[in-house]
């Protein structure tokens, strides 16, 4: 557990007066409909709020929307609906906010049935001004910004055309017809699938994958017989139909589709699916669905090329294509992921990995909690985390697990303590060491958010009744103060704070209901006066991440290195500040077998660090496809884990020889590709 010097609950002095002076109410002059909120840029304080109200009339639906802007983190809002000519904005497209601090915003308007095309409103000055632009097409999707250049936009039309703009939506050009799915890659590259015969659905499995690197001047077909494709980290994945039957396989490219290799993953049938759970530049977590309607599959982790995969976790809960999985990247500590498995008795259990999928284990039981009714042994049980699946089942779980990269080690989640995820009302648990140990933080379900890089945690009770109380903690959830932010309770709808957890402002959204009307209302609370001074060196303490045995020289070694962090002391009540940067000191570890994954044809028996040959491959030559050529692998069963930085120590031998033979099983070989220019 991270350091907790002050276990006693000391009250923050005079906090009621301090917060009262920093609580700002805004009542929106709106009939209650739906509300959506977007932050424009980072640390700009600019928030856009779009309220929409639908009145279903007999013949048609009458809609009204209003646009509001704040430039002080939500303390004050100005109605700027006139900047968009009081036009009704389509909420299903949301507000398309440009990348980084471009200040760009695109709103898609509702247009009348007979119009030639859609209409957008564009701003490139953080929504101070908008320009109306009529489109030569009706958009099917939200405008997508190129991550590299926010002037480049792409959109699909309702007629399946791929449209591109090079001047931030001022002028549009249709660069291809019959397009199913389009995505920006790196360097302003666009990848898209096309159909030849009837439609996207009809041609599923017979689609072509195309690439353009010059915004539609020229194209290259980089794949055929495509079912779908995805981008993750530096990997481009395509699921490709087999020649002879209805199965499909994953192929992977690390050079934008010029060359492909078949991933060493099981093929899947018509009713099954693949899903990229997480990907970075080092590796990918891939879920492969089990045959039949089982609701589970297997997680595989890739090598650094995305080709060779190790089985990571069996019976991984993932209900259906596009369905629910609890897979969660714990962003507050490197290498940590949480997910759910469907155990042999079909109960749902939470598992955690601290080494990027190498080993999975149950979550340790919080010391201040009893085992619930799901536990067979009342003294032995685990913490089980509620995530997407529980939310989809409409359990009393208002929020998914929360972690932030700059709030090191902190994980907050709803959970139950037993042998499995329970249907009883959950409590909120916190870990301050990235998931190794847990404590019950709040009784019952709550909304929660992290402010000031972990310096403050804010929570609101999840209730069907109106609320007027917010809770906050300045010591990572050990002690809580309550503040009544309004005399008149509101029906709470959400907490909003600036993404990145650096802000000290929190907005409480809800609506008031009187006899005749209901109105949107927000309360923005600034905690700057609670944390009255800036943190100094003495407020921080050194913490070794992943530490489980301080006596061991290799303690804290994960993926070949250990990291020491400067962590805010729990007893320090001070501001990390908006410019806070996580201070960490890495040190390289000696290599052990734990730093290697099992190579193609090998697996790790449970509770063993040695890789052994898969029985069905014993005595066979290990040959696999790489870039459309057949390779012969000479290995003693180990391959370095992607991203592992260990040096010295154990060093297993590994050699790959090119057999100079074509792979007949690779459907994406270079000779099946072609180029064309517009």
């Amino acid at each position: 557990s991270a350091p907790g010097e002050d276990e006693e609950c000391g009250r923050v002095r005079d906090f009621v007066a301090k917060l009262a002076n920093n609580t700002h109410q805004h009542v929106f002059d709106d009939l209650r409909g739906s509300v959506s909120l977007s932050w424009v840029g980072d640390s700009t304080g600019v928030i856009l709020v779009l309220t929409t109200f639908h009145v279903p009339l007999v013949i048609m639906t009458f809609g009204q929307s209003k646009l509001y802007r704040s430039e002080d983190y939500g303390k004050n809002f100005k109605d700027i609906t006139d900047l968009i000519n009081n036009t009704f904005i389509r909420t299903e497209f949301g507000m398309a906010i440009g990348p980084e601090n471009s200040g760009k915003v695109v709103l898609t308007a509702e247009v009348s049935g007979g119009s030639r095309g859609g209409r957008i409103f564009r701003s490139s000055d953080f929504a101070k001004n908008f320009v109306q632009t009529d489109l030569p097409f009706h958009p099917l999707t939200q405008m997508m910004y190129s991550p590299q250049n926010s002037d480049y936009l792409l959109a699909l039309s309702t007629e399946n055309g791929l449209w591109v703009s090079k001047n931030f939506g001022g002028k549009w050009e249709e660069i291809h017809k019959a397009v199913c799915l389009a995505k920006w890659g790196s360097d302003n590259t666009i990848f898209f699938t096309t159909y030849a015969n009837g439609s996207c659905k009809a041609d599923l499995g017979a689609l072509e994958l195309w690439r353009t690197s010059d915004l539609g001047k020229s194209f290259k077909t980089i794949g055929v017989k495509i079912y779908s494709f995805g981008l993750g980290g530096r990997f481009l994945f395509a699921s490709v139909m087999a020649d002879k039957d209805t199965t499909r396989r994953i192929h992977v490219s690390t050079d934008q589709g010029d060359t492909w290799s078949m991933a060493q993953l099981p093929s899947v049938g018509q009713e099954q699916f693949y899903s990229i759970l997480a990907a970075n530049d080092d590796m990918v977590f891939m879920h492969v669905d089990e045959p039949g309607d089982t609701g589970f599959g297997t997680i595989f982790t890739s090598d650094d090329r995305g080709i060779v995969y190790s089985k990571s976790l069996d019976r991984h809960l993932y209900t259906t294509t596009g369905g629910e999985t609890d897979f969660t990247n714990v962003t507050s500590l490197r290498g940590v992921y949480i997910t759910s498995v469907l155990s042999e008795d079909n109960s749902i259990q939470t598992m955690i990995t601290f080494d990027q999928g190498g080993r999975w284990t149950h979550l340790r039981k919080p010391e201040n909690s009893e085992c619930d009714a799901t536990a067979k042994n009342k003294n032995e049980c685990s913490l089980h985390i509620h995530a997407s699946y529980s939310i989809s089942q409409k359990l009393n779980v208002p929020m998914a697990p929360l972690s932030e990269p700059n709030a090191v080690g902190i994980v907050i989640a709803h959970g139950s303590v037993g042998d499995a995820i329970s249907v009883m009302v959950p409590d909120v648990y916190i870990s301050d060491d990235g998931g190794y140990s847990w404590t019950k933080m709040l009784e019952g379900p709550h909304y929660y958010t992290i402010l000031d890089s972990g310096g403050i945690i804010v929570a609101i009770e999840h209730s069907s009744r109106p609320i007027n109380v917010i809770k906050f903690s300045t010591d990572e959830g050990q002690c809580w103060q309550t503040y009544t932010f309004t005399r008149d309770p509101i029906y709470f709808t959400g907490l909003a704070s600036e993404p990145g957890a650096r802000s000290m402002n929190i907005s409480i959204w809800g609506f008031t209901e009187s006899f005749l009307t209901s109105q949107w209302v927000s309360y923005t609370i600034d905690f700057k006066d609670i944390l009255e001074r800036n943190c100094e060196e003495k407020d921080y303490t050194i913490w070794l991440a992943h530490s489980t045995d301080p006596e061991d020289y290799e303690d804290g070694c994960i993926l070949g290195y250990k990291e020491q962090f400067l962590r805010l002391r729990k007893s320090s009540v001070c501001q990390n500040g908006r410019d806070y940067v996580v201070t960490k000191q890495p040190s390289i570890c000696l290599c052990s077998l734990e730093d290697f994954l099992c190579d193609f044809g090998y697996y790790r028996p449970e509770n063993d660090s040695k890789c052994v040959e898969q029985p069905e491959l014993k005595g066979h030559d290990l040959e696999f496809c790489l870039y459309g050529r057949e390779e012969h692998l000479t290995t003693n069963g180990y391959r370095k884990i992607p991203g592992d930085k260990c040096q010295g120590g154990v060093n297993p031998v590994r050699e790959v020889k090119d057999l100079k033979k074509k792979c007949t099983s690779n459907f994406l070989s270079p000779e099946k590709q072609n180029s064309k220019s517009n």
Epitope: N346, L395, S422, V425
Partner: antibody, heavy 121, light 109 residues
């Protein structure tokens, strides 16, 4: 120990709506669990009607879905069944029951003693 | 929907004998999703077995469940006088509807 008690009229006219309530004691409905209704026509087997979670999430038997509404009132610690447009085929003993603690399972651990509802004019 | 067929419809046995009741599903059911109930005249059903083989709280160990896929069995090793009743199996897979078998009546011979 949780106890469940069904209540409601024993006689309902055809085409009318059958309304039953299940009062729960010894456990707060708002603390969780799925709560269900099962019926048993005289001399016949059991038929699951539907289940509800305290937050209002419901599952219904597709064969009855168009006629069934199950609701929950946490303030009174009870849940209710409404079955519209009844016919003689809806004559049965109606049981309320509580599901197990694990998410994703729907067997019934605790049962009320049942109430006979006859549909007749 | 999954149809459960119980056999025999009636089982006539004497106290002390072994009773074997069968429940067959129209399609495969995960063993974790099968439960058995006992019902005596004028009473509500009582949960005996869940997860095909786990005994509910307070159920004597003469009751045991087994099976997987489409074939499940409830066994009463030595019938006691209070065991004469109707027994129902129930499947509660991931998705509704959750269905019961037609029942097997165990009567005194």
């Amino acid at each position: 120990q949780v106890q469940l008690q069904e209540s409601g009229p024993g006689l309902v006219k055809p085409s009318e709506t059958l309304s039953l309530t299940c009062a729960v004691s010894g456990y707060s409905i708002s603390s969780g669990y799925y709560w269900g209704w099962i019926r048993q026509p005289p001399g016949k087997g059991l038929e699951w009607i539907g289940s509800i979670y305290h937050s209002g999430n419901t599952y219904y038997n597709p064969s009855l879905k168009s006629r069934v509404t199950i609701s929950v009132d946490t303030s009174k610690n009870q849940f209710s069944l409404k079955l519209s447009s009844v016919t003689a085929a809806d004559t049965a003993v109606y049981y309320c029951a509580r599901g197990p603690p694990e998410l994703g399972k729907m067997y019934f651990q605790h049962w009320g003693q049942g109430t006979l509802v006859t549909v007749s004019s | 929907e999954i149809v459960l067929t119980q056999s025999p419809g009636t089982l006539s046995l004497s106290p002390g004998e072994r009773a074997t009741l069968s429940c067959r599903a129209s399609q495969s059911v995960s063993s974790s999703y099968l439960a058995w109930y006992q019902q005596k005249p004028g009473q509500a059903p009582r949960l005996l077995i869940y997860g095909a083989s786990s005994r509910a709280t307070g159920i004597p160990d003469r009751f045991s469940g087994s099976g997987s896929g489409t074939d499940f069995t409830l066994t009463i090793s030595r019938l006691e006088p209070e065991d004469f009743a109707v027994y129902y199996c129930q499947q509660h897979g991931r998705l509704p509807p959750w269905t019961f078998g037609g029942g097997t009546k165990v009567e005194i011979k």
